[in-house]
C-alpha cells in the first residue's frame, strides 16, 4: 500500500516567540516525508511544508492572520518519493498537535533597551518596540500594537556601586525614573503579560545597559 512502513509523527510541539511560530515534531525521517496541515477550530485545513524531510514547519504566515484564534495542526507521514496520486484513497498516518492560541501562548522575546537619557536627576529609558509578522491593513504591527496595555515592561535599575535592584513599570515603552545626581546606574528590562499564569508570562531579561556607555546621553 501507499503508506507501508511509514511512522506517524509524534511529540508535536509549538515553538513561538513574538508570534514567529514553528511546529516541530519527531522522528527524523527514514524513508519518509511529511506534510503539515493547519486550521482554526471552525476553518478548513490548509496544507503547508509539502513532502518535507524536515521535522519542522514555519506556520507564522497562517497564525498571524488572527492571533486570537485557536489553531490545530496535523502532520501526515508519506513514503519517501511519494507523489500525490488521484487514485489513492488510503489516508496516511498522521498526528494532531496540541491546540495553540498565539495571543495567549507565544513567548515574549528578549527585550532590548533602545536608549536612555539623563536630564538632571531624571532618566528616561526607552525599550525597543519589536516588530512582529502580524499585519493590520498591510502594515506590520509591533509587539505593543498587538498586545496593547496587556504588555507591561518592568525596569530593574541599580547604582553601579550597589547590588539592590529598584523596579519601575510601564504599559508604554518608556520609563521616567528618579536617580541620584552623580551616580552611574545600570538597567535591565523584562516584558510581562500579567494576565497570563504560565511559563510564558515573562520574557528573559534584556542585556544590561549602564550609564557611561554609548546608548546613553547625559544633559544637565
Amino acid at each position: 500500500s501507499g503508506t507501508t512502513n511509514t511512522v506517524a509523527a509524534y511529540n508535536l510541539t509549538w515553538k513561538s516567540t513574538n508570534f514567529k511560530t514553528i511546529l516541530e515534531w519527531e522522528p527524523k525521517p527514514i524513508n519518509q516525508v511529511y506534510t503539515v496541515q493547519i486550521s482554526t477550530k471552525s476553518g478548513d485545513w490548509k496544507s503547508k511544508c509539502f513532502y518535507t524531510a524536515d521535522t519542522e514547519c514555519d506556520l507564522t504566515d497562517e497564525i498571524v492572520k488572527d492571533v486570537k484564534q485557536t489553531y490545530l495542526a496535523r502532520v501526515f507521514s508519506y513514503p519517501a518519493g511519494h507523489v500525490e496520486s488521484t487514485g489513492s484513497t488510503e489516508e496516511p498516518p498522521y498526528e494532531n498537535s496540541p491546540e495553540f492560541t498565539p495571543y495567549l501562548e507565544t513567548n515574549l522575546g528578549q527585550p532590548t533597551i533602545q536608549s536612555f537619557e539623563q536630564v538632571g536627576t531624571k532618566v528616561n529609558v526607552t525599550v525597543q518596540d519589536e516588530w512582529t509578522l502580524v499585519r493590520r491593513n498591510d502594515t506590520f504591527l509591533s509587539l505593543r500594537d498587538v498586545f496593547g496595555k496587556d504588555l507591561i515592561y518592568t525596569l530593574y535599575y541599580w547604582k553601579s556601586s550597589s547590588s539592590g535592584k529598584k523596579t519601575a513599570k510601564t504599559n508604554t515603552n518608556e520609563f521616567l525614573i528618579d536617580v541620584d545626581k552623580g551616580e552611574n546606574y545600570c538597567f535591565s528590562v523584562q516584558a510581562v503579560i500579567p494576565s497570563r499564569r504560565t511559563a510564558n508570562r515573562k520574557s528573559t531579561d534584556s542585556p544590561v545597559e549602564c550609564m557611561g556607555h554609548e546608548k546613553g546621553e547625559s544633559r544637565e
Partner: antibody
Amino acid sequence: EVQLVESGGGLVQPGGLLRLSCAASGFTIAYYVIHWVRQAPGKGLEWVGYIDPSNGYTYYADSVKGRFTISADTSKNTAYLQMNSLRAEDTAVYYCARDDQSLSSPFDYWGQGTLVTVSS
Amino acid sequence: DIQMTQSPSSLSASVGDRVTITCRASQDVNTAVAWYQQKPGKAPKLLIYSASFLYSGVPSRFSGSRSGTDFTLTISSLQPEDFATYYCQQHYTTPPTFGQGTKVEIK
C-alpha cells in the same frame, strides 16, 4: 488554589540568626515576584524586601539592608528570608506575599505569617 | 522613599454607615495604589488595586478613587465583617510603602 505558607519563626537571642521559608503552591514562583513584609506587635505593615526568582534580583528596606538576605529555590517553589544580626526591633510577624507584576503590582496573595521574637 | 499618609488613624462607625479613609502620597504615584483589609491575627487581604479596581471576590460596597496624589477607600454601607484595620500601599517605586493604617471600630 494559590497558597503561601511561612515557617521557621521562633524565639531567638539578639545577635542571633533565623531562616524563614515561604512555600508556594498553586502557582510557580519563577513567574512572579515574592515580597517579605513584617508587622511588629500592635504596629502597621513594613515592607522588608523582594526577590524576582526568575533572575535573582533583590532589594531591601534600609532597616534590614546588610543583615537580611532573600533567596529562592525555584525547584522547591520556595522563597527564603535569612535574618542575621537580629535585634529586638526585628520582633514581628513576618509575611511573604505574591506580587502579580501588573502595572500597580498589588500583593494579591499573602501567607498566614510566622512570628519572630528577638529577646534575651 | 515615598510616604503614604493615611487618615484617620482610627474611626468609630455603625453598621450601615458610609466610611471614607484617605491616603496622600508624598509624590506622584500614578494609580499604583492598593488597599488591604486586615483582621486581628490574620494576614492582610487585597481589596482594591490600581487605585480603583475591585479585586476578585471583594464585595461591591468597597470602592477606591484617586484625585492627584490623594487616594480614597470608601465602604458604602458598613457591614459587621468590615470592622478591621485598612492599609493603603503604593508600589509605583521601590521600596513599596504602606500607610500607617486605619482601625475601623464599632461605635
